[in-house]
């Protein structure tokens, strides 16, 4: 009886199992019982990344500089181009089709993880004993100054946004 299913890297057509085209090649004509599947390499700036029976290769992704994109990894006949964002920007999605400016962490917040071309800045509130008085995409929370270590006393308590203010110890005490 004619086959109803085929092995891996084959496909069923006209009651017959034909070889799929390897990655980097497209289908020109199906096999017959006398000749194998005819495949052709993808052209320049095209790719196919799986064993396939596609009659057209996919175009490589274009990393549009007008959208803040640049090429991270050039595509081959078997892989798509990988885009990333220019310095100071990150992708808006996993597909990285456009970029936005990295967010800054407001005063009272520090940078937990610096942004990359594909991920935004991650901020965290400054815990007790730490502060940040600037809006920054790089600065972590800084520890309050230890007045004690400087033989000074705390004139003003620190907050998440301000450092402590130290002053000379009151000699009358």
């Amino acid at each position: 009886e004619p086959p109803t299913a085929c092995r891996e890297k084959q496909y069923l057509i006209n009651s017959q199992c034909c070889s799929l085209c390897q990655p980097g090649q497209k289908l020109v004509s199906d096999c017959t019982e006398f000749t194998e599947t005819e495949c052709l390499p993808c052209g320049e700036s095209e790719f196919l990344d799986t064993w396939n029976r596609e009659t057209h290769c996919h175009q490589h992704k274009y990393c549009d500089p007008n959208l803040g994109l640049r090429v991270q990894q050039k595509g081959t006949s078997e892989t798509d181009t990988i885009c990333t964002c220019e310095e100071g920007w990150h992708c808006t999605s996993e597909a990285c089709e456009s970029c936005v400016l990295h967010r800054s962490c407001s005063p009272g917040f520090g940078v937990k993880q610096i942004a990359t071309g594909v991920s935004d800045t991650i901020c965290e509130p400054c815990p007790v004993g730490f502060f940040s008085n600037v809006s920054s995409a790089f600065e972590k929370c800084h520890p309050w100054t230890s007045c004690e270590d400087k033989n000074l006393e705390v004139l003003q308590k620190g907050t998440s946004q301000t450092n402590v203010i130290c002053g000379p110890q009151d000699r009358l005490r």
Epitope: P2, N14, Q16, T32, E33, T35, E36
Partner: antibody, heavy 117, light 107 residues
Amino acid sequence: EVQLLESGGGLVQPGGSLRLSCAASGFTFSSYAMSWVRQAPGKGLEWVSGIGSYGGGTYYADSVKGRFTISRDNSKNTLYLQMNSLRAEDTAVYYCARYVNFGMDYWGQGTLVTVSS
Amino acid sequence: DIQMTQSPSSLSASVGDRVTITCRASQSISSYLNWYQQKPGKAPKLLIYAASSLQSGVPSRFSGSGSGTDFTLTISSLQPEDFATYYCQQYGRNPPTFGQGTKLEIK
């Protein structure tokens, strides 16, 4: 034992017709693709035509397209080649062959077709 | 159609010799190549399929190699019964086509 026996060859005038037969035995005929291959006197092999199993597609060399017709009768275990508008260059020994995995593993003994006036 | 070119066209060798016949395709055919042996007045016989696989019942002194456009048939130690004509045949594109043949004669 697999056997293929061609018949129907002979002398024919240019423009004439001939029908070759190939009687198959010793295997499940309907399960195999079959083909005709010819060999002009003192020359090499030329693939002429093929027919898929289970009444599959038919395929021809450009040199015979439109003039030759391949067919099969699975109930009679027989392969045919109808040859019309014959030319001197069709003179050859015609072999029928069984196909398996893109190769011809069994061949008949051949039948001679001579096209001459 | 794909052209298959065999070399040499004829070859003289002695029993026990190692012999190599080459076959070149006019375009890439991957490993889609068969080799046949034909003796005078007889039908061809399949020796090698898919460029390098030995057909059942064929002696192991026959071997095939190659892919793309260049292929070889090697007989490691010629036996008297090996003197014949050898043909390559591609099945990468329709229609299947044969090389012109290599006649192996006794020296």
